[in-house]
């Protein structure tokens, strides 16, 4: 058993059949020493009487806040939480698998530059009762802050009969060195209880490998005189790190047919222009990635051709 | 070419040289998904590899101070990456075909450093981490891990020599 | 995009030879190793050797060493396997194959196949 | 050489049925192990490198798996268009050597 915060207690447990559980003895915290009684969540049966209370947990029905009295008088809680492993493996039931990049990816997180700023996000389909807490450092051994605010409910969505809930978080390192080559990952740890269920789960990753640009912004074309040729230009998003002679990305410029099976025609760039050919009813895409780190590409910013 | 005294190197050369080290470090380990190299053990492995720091000068701001701190830091992990790419962890099982990034890489690692430090100037170089992995498991992950490590170093690399192409060339 | 297209079948007499050409298009012929591997009928495949064309260096399988020459042609982009001192147990499918960009063997692209019979 | 002995040399599965096909190498190959399938008439395809890195394109119901020296592929859900003959490969250590093969059908 271990103390999540004041007053909740995780009770980690083997979870199978007619396995033994674990016994807890809980004290009052008070100064009194007779006369004191405990009760279980709202229910007013007597489970024991002293100062402490020993209890065998083995389900969740053992589970729920524990709460001493004297007298009619409440003396002070225990909010007793359960995680279960079941063969050797902790559970996972809260959240969602994403499965990108891998199996087993609970959370996932991104970064728009090399500021130390980033957002990592997960799925569930459990709509109440359901509390997060999210913290960060830089290492583990020796940890270098990381601030995180609240989790909060930043999308629904209704996939086949069930709803899916998307919460993120925002961190933001506390001493980022954006040109310095990481060399100590950031570790993200998210402490989720659903009712009496308590589980947790961590990602590992460095900055560099979450880069995800904004699209490029302004999106122009100016027809070349006497030519099917368009010169295609745009600007670093506003949100990328700078000088950018220092931080620079590389561009794909695609053309793209109205139909999906139309051949696509791709230019690779790192000048912030291209020329290329705009086809009727096509549409001309640009795509950033950082230039020196295979990262993710940004999402297309696109305009059409007409 | 930077000399310890602290004349400029060849900014433009060495951009080009370091974005094409990129490249070939990317080629020879596409992969970032096929097996999470922090997870498996041998931590001692690659902690020892040379990284740019916090203090090492290789920002912005840095650089128009006195790029000097920075080229020799760069010089050092060349020259570190070089030794590593040509030792036995790439050159025993599992086997690498001739055509393999990592000849060239190798070739292009040593071809840069000498960009930075000409014949006749020594810079202090680090210790390489006598490793002679005995299995192909231990040596594929080693390799795997290097490679990583180098694309994350030739990145911050080929930033400074863009950088200094773009606002420190005379 | 890469292609690799073999010469087509051939029937020979034992102890005679056959050459396999494969032209390579769609990337730098100089670039990559191109393989041989063989596929006797209902059987699995063996893998015979390769040439590296931008230093015309053959490595040969041990067991097909003295049977096998193989050569490449950077002004046709073409590689060529030569199988001498045929016998019935040399018959089978033949193929060229290049590998994964990175430098180890897994191979991504590959010829349609040659057949060679010996017979006699 | 290094051997690579695969079995089963042949089965027989219903569609839907999850199918599992083993290669054990006579040596450590670390994970360099790639499976192939080959339907008949045609050439071989890539499907699994690194023993568990899916090619481009090829459907999610391929999974590979195991590393040193032994190594597993499983087709989670067969299909109808699975039917063929599947191949281990060792790219580890000099001559390349490969599975006899399984040559899988449906029941």
């Known amino acids: 058993i271990w103390e999540l915060k004041k007053d909740v207690y995780v009770v980690e447990l083997d979870w199978y059949p007619d396995a033994p559980g674990e016994m807890v003895v809980l004290t009052c915290d008070t100064p009194e020493e007779d006369g004191i009684t405990w009760t279980l969540d709202q229910s007013s049966e007597v489970l024991g009487s002293g100062k402490t209370l020993t209890i065998q947990v083995k389900e969740f029905g053992d589970a729920g806040q524990y709460t001493c009295h004297k007298g009619g008088e409440v003396l002070s809680h225990s909010l007793l939480l359960l995680h279960k492993k079941e063969d050797g493996i902790w559970s996972t039931d809260i959240l969602k698998d994403q499965k990108e990049p891998k199996n087993k990816t609970f959370l996932r997180c991104e970064a728009k530059n090399y500021s130390g700023r980033f957002t990592c996000w997960w799925l569930t389909t459990i709509s109440t009762d359901l509390t997060f807490s999210v913290k960060s450092s830089r290492g583990s051994s020796d940890p270098q802050g990381v601030t995180c605010g609240a989790a909060t409910l930043s999308a629904e969505r209704v996939r086949g009969d069930n709803k899916e809930y998307e919460y993120s978080v925002e961190c933001q390192e506390d001493s980022a060195c954006p040109a310095a080559e990481e060399s100590l990952p950031i570790e993200v740890m998210v402490d989720a209880v659903h009712k009496l269920k308590y589980e947790n789960y961590t990602s590992s990753f460095f900055i560099r490998d979450i880069i995800k640009p904004d699209p490029p912004k302004n999106l122009q074309l100016k027809p070349l005189k006497n030519s099917r040729q368009v010169e295609v230009s745009w600007e670093y998003p506003d949100t990328w790190s700078t000088p950018h002679s220092y931080f620079s990305l590389t561009f794909c410029v695609q053309v793209q047919g109205k139909s999906k099976r139309e051949k696509k025609d791709r230019v690779f760039t790192d000048k912030t222009s291209a020329t290329v050919i705009c086809r009727k009813n096509a549409s001309i895409s640009v795509r950033a990635q950082d230039r020196y780190y295979s990262s993710s590409w940004s999402e297309w910013a696109s305009v059409p051709c007409s | 070419r930077a000399v310890p005294g602290g004349s400029s190197p060849a900014w433009t050369q060495c951009q080009q040289l370091s974005q094409k080290l990129c490249t070939l470090a990317w080629s020879a380990h596409p992969l970032v998904g096929h097996m999470d190299l922090r997870e498996e053990g041998d931590e001692e492995t690659t902690n020892d590899v040379p990284h740019i720091q916090c203090g090492d000068g290789c920002d912005p701001q840095g650089l128009r101070d006195n790029s000097q701190f920075c080229l020799q830091r760069i010089h050092q992990g060349l020259i570190f990456y070089e030794k590593l790419l040509g030792s036995d962890i790439f050159t025993g099982e599992p086997s690498l075909l001739p055509d393999s990034p990592v000849g060239q890489l190798h070739a292009s690692l040593l071809g840069l450093s000498q960009l930075l430090q000409p014949e006749g100037h020594h810079w202090e170089t680090q210790q390489i981490p006598s490793l002679s992995p005995s299995q192909p498991w231990q040596r594929l992950l080693l390799r795997f891990k290097i490679l990583r490590s180098l694309q994350a170093f030739v990145a911050v690399a080929a930033r400074v020599f863009a950088h200094g192409a773009a606002t420190l060339s005379p | 995009q890469v292609q690799l297209v073999q010469s087509g079948a051939e029937v020979k007499k034992p102890g005679s030879s056959v050459k396999v050409s494969c032209k390579a298009s769609g990337y730098t012929f100089t670039d990559q190793t191109i393989h041989w591997m063989r596929q006797a009928p209902g059987q699995g495949l063996e893998w015979i050797g390769y040439?590296?064309?931008?230093?015309?260096?053959?490595k040969y399988n041990e067991n097909f060493k003295g049977k096998v020459t193989i050569t490449a042609d950077d002004s046709t982009s073409t590689a060529y396997m030569e199988l001498s001192s045929l016998r019935s147990e040399d018959t089978a499918v033949y193929y060229c194959a290049i590998p994964d960009r990175s430098g180890y063997a897994w191979f991504i692209y590959w010829g349609q196949g040659t057949l060679v019979t010996v017979s006699s | 050489d290094i051997q690579m002995t695969q079995s089963p040399s042949s089965l027989s599965a219903s569609v839907g049925d999850r199918v599992t096909i083993t290669c054990k190498a006579s040596r450590d190959v670390a994970i360099a192990v790639a499976w192939y399938q080959q339907k008949p008439g045609k050439v071989p395809k890539l499907l699994i490198y690194?023993?568990?890195t899916r090619h481009t394109g090829v459907p999610s119901r391929f999974s590979g798996s195991g590393s040193r020296t032994d190594f597993t592929l499983t087709i989670s859900s067969l299909q109808p268009e699975d039917v063929a003959d599947y191949f281990c490969?060792?790219?580890?250590?000099?001559?390349?050597?490969f599975g006899s093969g399984t040559k899988l059908e449906i029941k």
């Open positions: 040439i590296y064309p931008r230093d015309d260096s053959p």
């Open positions: 690194w023993a568990s």
């Open positions: 490969h060792q790219y580890s250590s000099y001559p390349f050597t």
